[in-house]
């Protein structure tokens, strides 16, 4: 059959792996496109083929298979690299295929160039540790597949340039690398250098990942509206732009929702007739606590928008808390020739 | 800390074992490398046995060397048949990838 | 397989000047490269890992350099006390393929 399901390029999986290091490359059908996995496929008598484009060309070759040292070989569904170097980057397509059946997809592989400090185009996973919250550990990602579990690997840690050696509070522990007590002073890039010897050779495989110390649970509160309070009244006369800030801290807490929200009389404001703007900025603090600050804004106000009721919210996994602002109309100071003449008697 | 012993004068095809005994370094966490220095000339890796137990030798090492974990913190360097080509320093040291720290390593004189 | 050439094997140095001593592998090494100074009866004491990290406790004036194949040794305000032979050694492959991880050395002499 000369008629193919293809599932065209799928850029969602944009595959990075290093240069001059193994990479293990999973034919994508089985993973999200096909409800069947490869042994099932391959018991029924379905053939996977790959084949690639290079980069900046358009010609569809198959892959060599015939490199000195085996270099990239295929393995059931897995595309192996022993190592990668720069000119394998391109879009990579696998098929599966029998005299009745096709299906094919293709994805982008990228091969990375690493500085000596680690540093590289490579988008890297962040791992959030909670401030001065006891032992946390991160785990080296990605690294299952590459060797046979009976076979034990080196790992070295480094975090940027240095190796992880006689650090206080940081202790490596094979896989993972323990942080006794984090500390903001431990944000940074931590990478981890995987030995491990197969057939003949040693290869390294490295895998770098952010930490980032966030605010710790033990000390999340629920949301705390700064502005408005009771100390400040806005006091307007009918015409003048009305200002008002909600500002609202909001304690780091992972995965949680904050928002902030300004009701008028009760009303979302895109729910009344009045024109008002609402400006949002949001800042964090270096553990990642957040305040947002809402500015609700009536260029002209009216005596009617004076006598209304201007109440900021604000929600959090924590909880959720209203302050009402203070609004109300300027009385006019007398006019002073009127006061002189009462002064002096005058009807 | 690193320390190699067991260097000594021998006649030629006498087996010799050199010993490195590490101290305040876990050898199930580290990878032990055995680099020589013959008199006068440059450094020259012999061999490295990594955590997983598997051992490389250089090219001209294999069969005349033989590297392997004897304790928890020693790893023994056994010179199968010594040559007086064999006279030099023997150093061990920790790593793979890079050498850190090196013991102040131990002669050996093959000599009739 | 992954030899290191090194050059020059001997230099010569006035106090306050700079030496560059480069380090060269027949493949890509990745930036597995490391430095090393020997001094006469002593064991090499590491200066530099992974081309251009500075080993704990070793003075500013010694720089690395460099990726893929090519990596330079500098070493700035030479010193009388860097009189040494200097080491690079790679390491970004073992396998019994190799005669050797370290290039030949170079003997820095300090007038």
């Known amino acids: 059959s000369e008629r193919c399901d293809d599932w065209g390029l799928d850029t969602m999986r944009q595959i990075q792996v290093f240069e001059d290091e193994p990479a293990r490359i999973k034919c994508p059908l089985f993973e999200h496109f096909l409800k069947f996995n490869y042994s099932t496929a391959h018991s029924a008598g379905l053939t996977l083929i790959w084949y690639w484009t290079r980069q900046d060309r358009d010609l569809e070759e198959p892959i060599n298979f015939r490199l000195p040292e085996n270099r990239i070989s295929k393995e059931k569904d897995v595309l192996w690299f022993r190592p990668t170097l720069l000119n394998d980057t391109g879009n990579y397509t696998c098929m599966l295929r029998n005299t009745t059946y096709c299906s094919k997809v293709a994805f982008p592989l990228e091969v990375v160039q690493k500085d000596s400090c680690f540093n590289s185009p490579m988008k890297l996973p962040v791992h959030k540790l909670y401030i001065e919250y006891g032992i946390q550990r991160i785990t080296c990602p990605n690294v299952d597949g590459y060797f046979p579990s009976s076979v034990k690997p080196t790992i070295t840690w480094y975090m940027g340039c240095y190796k992880i050696q006689n650090f206080n509070n940081v202790i490596p522990e094979g896989m993972n690398l323990s942080f006794l007590i984090a500390l903001i002073s431990n944000n940074g890039n931590y990478t981890c250098v995987v030995t491990y010897p197969e057939n003949g050779r040693t290869f390294h495989l490295t895998r770098t990942l952010t930490v980032k110390v966030v605010g710790s649970p033990k000390n999340a509160v629920p949301p705390v509206i700064h502005s408005p309070n009771d100390h400040v009244v806005y006091e307007k006369e009918p015409g003048e732009e009305l200002l008002i800030p909600c500002t609202v801290y909001f304690s780091f807490l992972m995965d949680s929702r904050n928002e902030v929200w300004w009701t008028i009389d009760g009303k979302k404001p895109d729910d009344i007739t009045i024109d008002v703007t609402i400006n949002e900025s949001i800042s964090h603090s270096r553990t990642e606590d957040e305040t947002r600050t809402q500015i609700l804004s009536i260029k002209k106000v009216t005596s009617e928008d004076l006598k209304r009721s201007y109440v900021c919210h604000a929600r959090s996994a924590k909880g959720e808390v209203a302050k009402a602002a203070k609004v109300k109309q300027k009385v006019p100071a007398p006019r002073y020739t009127v006061e002189l003449a009462c002064g002096f008697g005058a009807t | 800390s690193v320390e190699e012993s067991g260097g000594r004068l021998v006649t030629p095809g006498t087996p010799l074992t050199l010993t490195c005994t590490v101290s305040?370094?876990?050898?199930?966490?580290?990878?032990m490398s055995w680099v020589r220095q013959a008199p006068g000339e440059g450094l020259e890796w012999i061999g490295t046995?990594?955590?997983?137990?598997?051992v490389y030798y250089a090219t001209w090492a294999k069969g005349r060397f033989t590297i392997s974990k004897t304790s928890s913190t020693t790893v023994d360097l056994e010179i199968t048949s010594p040559t007086t080509e064999d006279t030099a320093t023997y150093f061990c040291a920790r790593g793979s990838i890079d050498y850190d720290p090196w013991g102040p390593g131990t002669l050996v004189t093959v000599s009739s | 397989a992954y030899d290191m050439t090194q050059t020059p094997a001997s230099v010569e140095a006035a106090v306050g000047g700079t030496v560059t001593i480069k380090c060269q592998a027949s493949q890509s090494i990745s930036s597995w490269l490391s430095w090393y100074q020997q001094k006469p009866g002593q064991p090499p004491k590491q200066l530099i890992y992974?081309?251009?990290t500075l080993a704990s406790g070793v003075s500013s004036r010694f720089k690395g350099s460099g990726s893929g194949t090519d990596y330079t040794l500098t070493i700035s305000g030479v010193q009388s006390d860097d009189a040494a032979t200097y080491y690079c050694q790679q390491g970004y492959i073992t396998s019994s393929n190799i005669k050797n991880v370290f290039g030949g050395g170079t003997e820095v002499v300090v007038k």
């Open positions: 992974r081309a251009s």
């Open positions: 305040g370094i876990d050898l199930s966490s580290y990878d």
């Open positions: 046995i990594y955590v997983s137990g598997r």
